[in-house]
Amino acid sequence: VKMAETCPIFYDVFFAVANGNELLLDLSLTKVNATEPERTAMKKIQDCYVENGLISRVLDGLVMTTISSSKDCMGEAVQNTVEDLKLNTLGR
Amino acid sequence: EICPAVKRDVDLFLTGTPDEYVEQVAQYKALPVVLENARILKNCVDAKMTEEDKENALSLLDKIYTSPLC
């Protein structure tokens, strides 16, 4: 949950690619005004996930989730929250 | 804002070699089945995507990272 809060559109696109769902990917890419060549590039990546099957998608999703919830990222998220709180306090 | 570790993972997935990418994944999930899967996907992407495709994927990522939705 926390990782999706940091950059929701990234995770939208990532999971649409890894999921192999072309319609979902198109919807996600529309949100960032992706050009046709950019869409083509993302679909080539998506093809690799589709070709390698469900287990491949699950395993790579696991990698992304693990990285996103690692101390490298969570430490960053906590640090950002602390900075935000400091700014808000100073703002008052 | 996207986490730098995630950004590095995605950058290596697109622009690195399979060896580099798998080494990066291993820092977070050192299971042999996960690492072999990462290598398979990376090699697949390298074979499918041209230099131009990768440029386009990188420009899309820039749009994502700078989007108000990120």
Epitope: - | T17, N43, T50
Partner: antibody, heavy 120, light 106 residues
């Protein structure tokens, strides 16, 4: 056009050291991964090492690991191979080769090679 | 370490004939296989990348196929200038060359 020119080869005694260089031109050197590949007299090609575009990551074949060091100077468009503890079996023509940008191919352009002879 | 085995080691073929060189990997390497041509006293030149993609400027008589562990380089109508040694290279994990196949014109 892409040009790779190796230099630094020569005759060296077993146990000795040698530093090979590869001067690159005709492309943005700092964008590309680079390799060293060798070919012993009358034999096939053997990949020995590659280095990432920034120089931060290096990989080696087992036959040279711990003895050879690949490095680069992007400001000078140069690739290097430091060879220590040289053995007779290191006698070969040494080629530098460029990888396609973003790992889109391994070894798309090669230099003409420089000859290293290890003999007492 | 992935071992690449080419066959045959040597082939003598008449002009205009078809040449087939195979390369077998000791494990699945997907499509991460490249083919090179080396003429005597010259440096190698890339012919085919990722199993079947022709490199720019390479004559159309050269083609590649295969995936997984078995790969083929085909020269459709051999010309005199094709006399050379041909090598496969895997880039699936690190890099390994096959031992080479020498093609001679009859």
């Amino acid at each position: 056009q892409v040009q790779l020119v190796e230099s630094g080869g020569g005759l060296v005694k077993p146990g000795g050291s040698l530093r090979l260089s590869c001067a690159a031109s005709g492309f943005t050197f700092s964008d590309y991964y680079m390799n060293w590949i060798r070919q012993a007299p009358g034999k096939g090609l053997e990949w020995i090492s590659y280095i990432s575009s920034s120089g931060s990551t290096t990989y080696y074949a087992d036959s040279v690991k711990g003895r050879f060091t690949i490095s680069r100077d992007n400001a000078k468009n140069s690739l290097f191979l430091q060879m220590n503890s040289l053995r007779g079996e290191d006698t070969a023509v040494y080629y530098c080769a460029r990888d396609g940008r973003y790992n889109t191919v391994a070894g798309d352009y090669w230099g003409q090679g420089t000859t290293v002879t290890v003999s007492s | 370490e992935i071992v690449m085995t080419q066959s045959p080691d040597f082939q003598s073929v008449a002009p205009k004939e078809k040449v087939t060189i195979t390369c077998r990997a000791s494990q699945n390497i997907g499509g991460s296989l490249h083919w090179y041509q080396q003429k005597p006293d010259q440096s190698p030149k890339l012919l085919i990348k990722y199993a079947s993609q022709s490199f720019s400027g390479v004559p159309s008589r050269f083609s590649g196929s295969g995936s997984g562990t078995d790969f083929t380089l085909t020269i459709n109508s051999l010309e005199a200038e094709d006399a050379a040694t041909y090598y496969c290279l895997q880039s699936y994990t690190l890099r390994t060359f096959g031992q080479g196949t020498k093609v001679e014109i009859k």
